[in-house]
Amino acid sequence: PSPPPEKKELRKVAHLTGKSNSRSMPLEWEDTYGIVLLSGVKYKKGGLVINETGLYFVYSKVYFRGQSCNNLPLSHKVYMRNSKYPQDLVMMEGKMMSYCTTGQMWARSSYLGAVFNLTSADHLYVNVSELSLVNFEESQTFFGLYKL
Amino acid sequence: PSPPPEKKELRKVAHLTGKSNSRSMPLEWEDTYGIVLLSGVKYKKGGLVINETGLYFVYSKVYFRGQSCNNLPLSHKVYMRNSKYPQDLVMMEGKMMSYCTTGQMWARSSYLGAVFNLTSADHLYVNVSELSLVNFEESQTFFGLYKL
Amino acid sequence: PSPPPEKKELRKVAHLTGKSNSRSMPLEWEDTYGIVLLSGVKYKKGGLVINETGLYFVYSKVYFRGQSCNNLPLSHKVYMRNSKYPQDLVMMEGKMMSYCTTGQMWARSSYLGAVFNLTSADHLYVNVSELSLVNFEESQTFFGLYKL
């Protein structure tokens, strides 16, 4: 007899977009409306919660902009938290200093993306240094991953 | 009897590189020569045409440069068009303002990459704000995707 | 009888992080400690060595910074070398010119990522123009790939 039909496993994937009511760190994300994806991964209080150990490609983009450039240092981090470890682990980080002309209207993006071995119950978050300078348009600021 | 050998499906993938005869938007791409890939996806008038619904990682990089900086706002968009929808959907976007010193020779890149749920017959394109400031070297300006 | 259990093939993947004892080009990488991954790919003298022909997503980020900006042109390249070809092939490249205010402390990242058809025995490397301006923190400067 032929083997039973293969059970097509749902791809573990997330693509979350900017949410302008973020008031503190970590950033919060839109997980329901628009071009959002969330399958086989949970979203909880700003974090993507891994429920299956394995290799994941993780990415994030943040769009910073301002009206009167003061060159405040900008940072953009993707970090991981797990109850088994006391401290957050910074997985990827981008920093910018001296990036615009004083007083000018300015805009700049930071993009991060790489492969990590993640464990069930890992929580992934995004942090920025200057929340007031982030623009949360869904096409400009986002956070995602997929299991390889 | 043993089951028939598995039919290895061709990976749906594209990597197109800059084409300097782009005269208008959307950008046009080299789809034949050099480090180009095009498999299971069609290329038509600047666009990648999806022929199988599913999850795709989509990416693009654009290299902007100029002889004498005047800080024209730069934008780099990946957008989607489908005959079922009246309006283009901007999937990812990068913007830059106040990024160089007035009068200086300058160079800067914009990188975008994320996961999207695409539908058969979706057309994906890249748009930039200042075509004359784009350098089309194959290693510097490109557009690609692959099905997860 | 039921077919033999499928042999789960190890995913070919690498994520290497910055190594501050790089003294010349190509950059050298940490391949053992920290958030490093190396599976089904070899690391040799700064290079990732492909041992199975196929499609790979290749990425790299480099974090440049300095104490006193003098706007030295920065370049960041991922290139490929194979004994069958006389010359290195630049796969991806980012360049920056006129990116900070003269005399100021500055920081900037370059990110590259795309899909390539790689052949067994291809060696992949990362090159930068100004080694002294690279910061090698593991979260900031990295090089990786995975087989699709």
């Epitope: 009206q67 009167s68 003061n70 405040l72 007083g103 | - | -």
Partner: antibody, heavy 119, light 111 residues
Amino acid sequence: QVQLVQSGAEVKKPGASVKVSCKGSGYTFTDYTIHWVRQAPGQGLEWMGVISTYQGDASYNQKFKGRVTMTVDKSTSTVYMELSSLRSEDTAVYYCARFPDWDYAMDYWGQGTLVTVSS
Amino acid sequence: EIVMTQSPATLSVSPGERATLSCKASQSVDYDGDSYMNWYQQKPGQAPRLLIYAASNLESGIPARFSGSGSGTEFTLTISSLQSEDFAVYYCQHSRELPYTFGQGTKLEIK
């Protein structure tokens, strides 16, 4: 509460220089650029330039280039505007104003400093 | 640089009535969906006070009788029902690019 307090009135001779100070309090000083605007007697407002309180560099109105210098002392949360080679038409009230990078306009202003240039 | 032109130079209105002040820019002050136009009020011997930012947004603490409108090159400040404390000079200013420039001002006086 947010305050920008400027130094007192000055009388200068033509050809001299004047240095006006502007001290910020009640907010995180290095989060805001400081702009300088002047107003000649009975006239409108004229933008002179802006300084980064974080980085210390400035952008000036071309009209004043070479005559104006803006500096910052982060330790005292004070910005200085020095105008050299004074002429009678520089007689004006000089204002400092802060500008939040994330906003659209100068939201708080100093009380103004009258500089009189007269022989 | 962008030149701002206000009209009229002087406007005489009775208390309780509506006042409409106009400002024109020599080129568009819009970018990316926003209009970089601000309005300030100045009384004799005082520093300017921000009323409206980004063409139509009321600054915190400013009475709702003040409103702004317009986009591109043409902007309007409207005071719906003039109070005695509203008689002052009003300036428009763009913040689209450096150098910022102000209009020459409109003096609002009691009729």
